[in-house]
Interface confidence: low
Amino acid sequence: GCLTQLYENAFFRGGDVASMYTPNAQYCQMRCTFHPRCLLFSFLPASSINDMEKRFGCFLKDSVTGTLPKVHRTGAVSGHSLKQCGHQISACHRDIYKGVDMRGVNFNVSKVSSVEECQKRCTSNIRCQFFSYATQTFHKAEYRNNCLLKYSPGGTPTAIKVLSNVESGFSLKPCALSEIGCHMNIFQHLAFSDVDVARVLTPDAFVCRTICTYHPNCLFFTFYTNVWKIESQRNVCLLKTSESGTPSSSTPQENTISGYSLLTCKRTLPEPCHSKIYPGVDFGGEELNVTFVKGVNVCQETCTKMIRCQFFTYSLLPEDCKEEKCKCFLRLSMDGSPTRIAYGTQGSSGYSLRLCNTGDNSVCTTKTSTRIVGGTNSSWGEWPWQVSLQVKLTAQRHLCGGSLIGHQWVLTAAHCFDGLPLQDVWRIYSGILNLSDITKDTPFSQIKEIIIHQNYKVSEGNHDIALIKLQAPLNYTEFQKPICLPSKGDTSTIYTNCWVTGWGFSKEKGEIQNILQKVNIPLVTNEECQKRYQDYKITQRMVCAGYKEGGKDACKGDSGGPLVCKHNGMWRLVGITSWGEGCARREQPGVYTKVAEYMDWILEKTQSSDGKAQMQSPA
């Protein structure tokens, strides 16, 4: 299953499959997730080791048993690959690293006014993988405001150095935020020239294209079909690059197929997995296990559940079958692709779905990286769980926010439904940033069921929580995925990085905002909060957040939306925007429903609704 815990001051011994430099443990974990053999990783932050060569070292590891011995190493961070973790699987990494220079091949330098602009330039350059930006206070005046676009053979820095007044980060192309756009066309009977960066065997050009999309240096590809004239080259997928970023030439060639990486697509990337099953095809590889199962789909499920399994062949040979069950060969290879593909067999083959984003309903997210008063504009995919609850009567308007917590579930505030408990007037928009982008053609979800907490009373602040069951489940994308719920009764975690988001008013007597706003707000103790609200009872089932001086807060229209906090690289839904005295007033913090206190209720309602738990707290 999915293991998300990180081990502080621990280093996995042995099992190395690869190593690289990464700026933090989360990026190291992402590289482990996408490495075909990596199950575990260990990361050495700069503070953990004196050896300059090993600072920022990210060690990817495999183990036949699924585990490795842990040794104590001060400062080291270790953890698991997020294979099998569904919507937590993402190659998108938004963080900016201050005081760090990520080294690579510098192929472009320009003057820009901010690190965000530098990141945008990198994202809009086809070859840029990461960048460094020298700030206004950099010690050498001639380098100030320089934006260096970089790449490397493996897509990760060739070295990482601690350097004051330098900020570094990665391209946001894997976040589907590139302005370049992509070529979806597949070119039959055409071979591209230029540099081969890798060679794998694939059953078709579509698998070849997906592998190209997630390979750090592949910009385009050529696939040789199973009837290509040279037998040894059949089913070969050549991943390619060029200096210009496009093929310098192409040759008409029977039984070849060419195309482009889809990494530069805007708003949607292919899933990093291959779900198709190939009848009459055998995939060769290292044998992991052989099991008797009923049907090829069960064989694929078995492969998906066995974390080291990369692909499988389900044999229908009489000698491989007993009654209704046949042999399911679970296999793996060095690069995650079959070592041999044979046609015209009595088998069916396919791949593990361990890297599919849709994944299991019961896993929470760690990724992404009332309008808000004193906030700033959010960017695409920054808060992919945020939804807009809108009412369509004569006109249509945004009333509340909400948080996606499962394929078919949204968590919001009960008071959003005061006077509007009718299911059919509500429209739920997910995966959006600008309310102005909503037209009559924009897809929305309808409500199947509104579940208001049984102890909620209109115009009281207690138990302000409601669940919405959607009529149809949503697919997860970079812009639409759930937020992780906290552990039941989570009181021990000290959250220091909390954000409130919404399209609500920007001042007390304001109006709904177009762009989703975000604001960083510190949590306030319940004792402190109670002092500020002497006419109200601040219960243990509430959480407060705000600045003593005011100026930043949630406001009308943000209600029901998320208060999320990042802890150990994982975002958790700590609160639901509920109420407050005005907006952003001095010494009047916002009051939020404390989600951890309602975990039993959430799990009971989502389970009883269709007999199966739909979301789960982090492990």
Partner: antibody, heavy 119, light 107 residues
Framework: EVQLLESGGGLVQPGGSLRLSCAAS????????MGWVRQAPGKGLEWVSG????????MYADSVKGRFTISRDNSKNTLYLQMNSLRAEDTAVYYC????????????WGQGTLVTVSS | DIQMTQSPSTLSASVGDRVTITCRAS??????LNWYQQKPGKAPKLLIY???SLQSGVPSRFSGSGSGTDFTLTISSLQPEDFATYSC?????????FGQGTKVEIK
């Protein structure tokens, strides 16, 4: 077909230097940990050094630490072992080996190159 | 460093015999143990990795077992081509140490 071909061995005087090379083919060199293992005449195998795929991380046996340097050029699919301050006890056949992923077992070996340290 | 001790150093056997070689580690190495076969003038060949996993292309008469500190290589029915030296190697930690080898010779 995976192939590893060592070169650079020969006779050298104590205190001298040699550079061994290992040309790799038939696999994606840049994805694998590579290493050197030696075998003194009539003796068992002794692991000498290893290097990670990126080349950024290296490992050495205590007996060669500070004297030998392992390196690789992924663009040339070549592994190197720079041997300085050679001693008589470094006399051996030096094998280049590829480590299989996940279990750190050298799964493919070259045929070896003989290094003789003698005055 | 982890010491690897093999026994016996030499083993005389006939074709068709069942042969067992043991390898002991000076500390717990989980299942991080590999077995190699080497013939005179040739490079070693990987037989078994991770204590019991058979390397691709190796005959099934070879098998490995054990975990922790004690490991065994078994040849179920010795064939003429199996007369060689067998070595164990731990891959649990650096340096990756080998056993001193067991020579299987014709009785």
């Amino acid at each position: 077909e995976v192939q590893l071909l060592e070169s650079g061995g020969g006779l050298v005087q104590p205190g001298g230097s040699l550079r061994l090379s290992c040309a790799a083919s038939g696999f994606t060199f840049s994805l694998y940990i590579m290493g050197w293992v030696r075998q003194a005449p009539g003796k068992g195998l002794e692991w000498v050094s290893g290097i990670y795929p990126s080349g950024g991380f290296t490992m050495y046996a205590d007996s060669v630490k500070g004297r030998f340097t392992i390196s690789r050029d992924n663009s040339k699919n070549t592994l190197y072992l720079q041997m300085n301050s050679l001693r008589a006890e470094d006399t051996a056949v030096y094998y280049c080996a590829r480590e299989s992923s996940g279990v750190a077992a050298p799964d493919y070996w070259g045929q070896g190159t003989l290094v003789t340290v003698s005055s | 460093d982890i010491q690897m001790t093999q026994s016996p150093s030499t083993l005389s056997a006939s074709v068709g015999d069942r042969v067992t070689i043991t390898c002991r580690a000076s500390q717990n190495i989980s299942s991080y143990l590999n077995w190699y076969q080497q013939k005179p003038g040739k490079a070693p060949k990987l037989l078994i990795y991770a204590a019991s996993s058979l390397q691709s292309g190796v005959p099934s008469r070879f098998s490995g077992s054990g975990s922790g500190t004690d490991f065994t290589l078994t040849i179920s029915s010795l064939q003429p081509e199996d007369f060689a030296t067998y070595s164990c190697q731990q891959s649990y930690s650096t340096p990756r140490t080998f056993g001193q080898g067991t020579k299987v010779e014709i009785k």
